[in-house]
């Protein structure tokens, strides 16, 4: 059910904030914001507004009891999630009450305000407002006058407006930041017998940029090893600034010195430090000491304080480069070599070179990382870096060999570098072509001469530059008096053709055809493959009907007179 009493409202409210009327409240409200309160009726949404979460009703305008003494409104409480009303819509009344015994009340118990430091006298700080609910037509009971009880000589208040202003020149935040001012509001025009109320105004001087950054020392010295990569922080410098916030923000820059191109300075936004970093690769052997002039400046400067001097400071930074024993450096990032697959053992493929970049120019020895050449196919001359074979190669087994060569300083074996070597094995014609598959075909007893009974395909493991070119022929021992011919199609295929009209499977059930396949590369490679041809009974469409199974089961004793 709804929980409220009749609402009364003091007329003639003059405050800057809305005037609190009362609270609509349902006993279904768990206080968790799950309900939404809705107001309708006289002046709803205009004269009277409701906080939809709390049910607090406020009057937005000055109300006049003589003009309208009663407002009739309706209230709803709705579940925010479902839209379901938790109470029936209900009517309530707001009565405008006219009383004459109210003291001025400030809209806030405590005000907080800010004003920039170093402000001119008379600068606006904040306006405090007190209201008196009495009838303003009744004497001066609603006439309020403001005065300052605490806070002089720093601040003053305008008696009629409640406007607080600065009253002292050059108030410096760096000396004092917080002020507590007590303001009194008195009705009856401030005369004796008037009622009064007070409020506290906590005033904070906000910072302006009236202090420059300053380095605590004129010279800084840092050391860094020559191996420091670009971006490496070398050291931090920090200028201090008595201001705060963006007025204390510092930007660091290198303005001069022979290290201008070699180093950078980055501003750390969190700590306001300048971080000196390496910009380019250093070389102890070339230059051992750099001097920089670093400047700290405020990015945001207020022109009216420029008379105090420049808002920047500079310091000298001396950077000492420390020597580092560096590993050898190869002449290339990677080496690509090639060698024929028929190369003899100890054939030289190429060479690598590496040098110690240090001033000492320590001698270097070379070795193969055996993890990358487990089969020890390659070796290296430890003195001159020549790469040579230590085993025979086969391109058909492995086309590329990827190995790693190590260069090590002889005087300091801890200093070593590695480089990848990519060795390509070049093709040599060392494989004969052979049938792409095992061929077993059949011929019909009633076959006509020159009838194609099988197409042959070949493969070759080699990879000649101009592509494969195979030729096919009957083996010499089978060429004369053969019952079949080989027709080379000149496209790396060949056909087996019948050579006579009709075959008798009772006379000869199976023929074995030896076929020679040759490639066209140097040196020429060839192989002989055998094609089995079975004689079968066929229907008039040429579909096989039966063959002698013995041809498959007992191949011994078969004629090779193909």
């Amino acid at each position: 059910s709804w929980m409220w009493n009749q609402f009364f409202l003091l007329e003639e409210y003059t405050g800057s904030d809305y005037q609190y009327v009362g609270k609509l409240h349902s006993d279904q409200d768990r206080g968790d914001g799950s309900l939404k309160y809705i107001l309708s009726g006289d002046g709803a949404g205009d004269l009277f507004i409701i906080n939809e979460n709390t049910g607090d009703i406020q009057a937005t305008k000055r109300l006049d009891r003589e003009e309208k003494p009663v407002y009739i409104l309706r209230a709803q409480a709705i579940n925010r999630r479902t839209g379901r009303p938790v109470e029936p819509e209900s009517e309530f009344i707001i009565k405008i009450h006219d009383i004459n015994d109210n003291e001025p009340i400030f809209t806030k118990e405590v005000y907080t305000a800010t004003v920039p430091e170093m402000s001119d006298v008379g600068t606006f700080v904040v306006q405090v407002t007190a209201t008196d609910a009495d009838d303003p037509t009744y004497g001066n009971s609603a006439k309020v006058v403001y005065s300052i009880l605490q806070g002089q000589p720093y601040f003053s208040v305008e008696s009629e407006t409640g406007i607080i202003k600065t009253a002292l020149l050059n108030m410096d935040r760096e000396n004092r930041e917080q002020y507590q001012v007590v303001i009194q509001a008195k009705d009856m025009g401030g005369q004796m017998g008037g009622l009064s109320g007070t409020t506290t105004v906590n005033i904070t001087l906000t910072d302006v940029n009236d202090n420059p950054p300053r380095f605590p020392q004129s010279t800084y010295q840092f050391k860094t090893p020559e191996s420091s990569p670009p971006g490496t922080p070398i050291g931090r410098i920090k200028a201090s600034d008595a201001d705060v916030g963006e007025n204390a923000e510092i930007e660091y820059s290198i303005t001069d010195g022979e290290g201008l191109d070699m180093f950078d300075v980055i501003t750390d936004q969190e700590t306001q430090e300048g971080i000196i970093t390496v910009k380019k690769l250093l070389d102890f052997e070339k230059k051992k000491v750099y001097t920089l002039k670093v400047e700290a400046s405020n990015p945001y400067v207020e022109p009216r304080f420029l008379y105090l001097g420049p808002f920047k400071d500079s310091a000298t930074v001396r950077i000492v480069v420390e020597d580092v024993d560096e590993p050898p450096v190869f002449s290339k990032l990677a080496y690509i070599l090639q060698i024929r697959e028929d190369a003899q053992i100890n054939t030289t493929i190429g060479s690598v070179t590496a040098q110690d970049p240090d001033a000492a120019r320590n001698p270097v020895k070379y070795s193969v990382d055996r993890h990358t050449d487990m089969d020890r196919i390659f070796n290296i001359d430890s003195g001159n870096g020549s790469i040579f074979t230590s085993k025979l190669l086969d391109r058909e087994t492995l086309l590329w060999h990827n190995i790693t060569v190590i260069a090590t300083e002889i005087n300091n074996p801890k200093q070593s570098s590695r480089v990848p070597l990519y060795i390509k094995v070049l093709d040599v014609n060392d494989n004969a072509p052979e049938f792409a598959e095992f061929y077993e075909t059949f011929v019909c007893e009633k076959a006509k001469a020159d009838q194609l009974i099988q197409t042959l395909h070949a493969v070759d493991k080699d990879d000649p530059y101009s592509g494969h070119q195979f030729s096919f022929s009957l083996a010499p021992e089978a060429a004369s008096g053969s019952n079949f011919t080989i027709q080379d199609n000149k496209d790396n295929t060949a056909g087996i053709l019948t050579r006579k009209n009709g075959y008798n499977r009772h006379e000869m059930s199976t023929y074995l055809l030896p076929v020679v396949i040759s490639d066209n590369d140097y040196p020429v490679q060839s192989s002989t493959g055998t094609v089995t041809v079975r004689v079968c009974a066929c229907d008039h469409h040429g579909n096989m009907q039966s063959c002698h199974a013995e041809a498959l089961i007992h191949p011994t004793g078969l004629s090779t007179g193909a």
């Epitope: 579940n79 999630r81 479902t82 109470e87 029936p88």
Partner: antibody, heavy 117, light 111 residues
Framework: EVQLVQSGAEVKKPGSSVKVSCKAS????????MHWVRQAPGQGLEWMGD????????HYTQKFKDRVTITVDKSTSTAYMELSSLRSEDTAVYYC??????????WGQGTTVTVSS | DIQMTQSPSSLSASVGDRVTITCRAS??????????MHWYQQKPGKPPKLLIY???NLESGVPSRFSGSGSETDFTFTISSLQPEDIATYYC?????????FGGGTKVEIK
């Protein structure tokens, strides 16, 4: 401008889980309930559950109670819906929608979840 | 659970026609004069869009040819003059009681 932006499409195996996100902007995240509604291919709309971002109070439909978990991250104004023990019939477009007084006044663009072995 | 029966499941009408869709709840979805029934439009490949809330209130930005009425268990959604851009599926939804449920949808096509 109120916007609800959902995470991208997901392909999941049966038995696994999926977690769909919904990033809200253009309004005070904690002032409105966030709901999840799904729509199987060629089918109608099916309400799964909702959450009050300010208190993380949740409501789930009985059908999904043991498999669905709705959460929020107030710091990023993001709502999440995790559905576990997925089966092929969970293949659907999953929508987040802002709730206001029982109605869904703003919807996400939808996230397609495909459950397939 | 409150069952929402929407009819017809599909309809075909001409441009300019008056189109009416009904939605029946298995129990009352009204309380204290508030009817917790809402209507949505969904076009293919898009999320639904709120048209009518609390049975008869037009959502901001929605054309006035759309309207809704009804109370308790019987509700009606009307398009006073069908336009080509109204081709879509329309759904009713109740928020009276958990779980919130939708009607099966009505597919509206142009003849």
């Amino acid at each position: 401008e109120v916007q609800l932006v959902q995470s991208g499409a997901e392909v999941k195996k049966p038995g696994s889980s999926v977690k769909v996100s919904c990033k809200a902007s253009g309004y005070t995240f904690t002032n409105y309930w966030m709901h999840w509604v799904r729509q199987a291919p060629g089918q109608g709309l099916e309400w799964m559950g909702d959450i009050d971002p300010s208190h993380s109070e949740t409501h789930y439909t009985q059908k999904f109670k043991d498999r669905v978990t709705i959460t929020v991250d107030k710091s990023t104004s993001t709502a999440y819906m995790e559905l576990s023990s997925l089966r092929s019939e969970d293949t659907a477009v999953y929508y987040c929608a802002r709730g206001d007084l029982g109605r869904f006044d703003y919807w996400g663009q939808g996230t397609t979840v495909t459950v397939s072995s | 659970d409150i069952q929402m029966t929407q009819s017809p499941s599909s309809l075909s009408a001409s441009v300019g026609d008056r189109v009416t869709i009904t939605c029946r709840a298995s129990e009352s979805v009204s309380i204290h004069g508030t009817h917790l029934m809402h209507w949505y439009q969904q076009k293919p490949g898009k999320p639904p869009k709120l048209l009518i809330y609390a049975a008869s209130n037009l959502e901001s930005g929605v054309p006035s040819r759309f309207s809704g009425s009804g109370s308790e268990t019987d509700f009606t959604f009307t398009i006073s003059s069908l336009q080509p851009e109204d081709i879509a599926t329309y759904y009713c939804q109740q928020s009276f009681e958990d779980p919130w449920t939708f009607g099966g949808g009505t597919k509206v096509e142009i003849k």
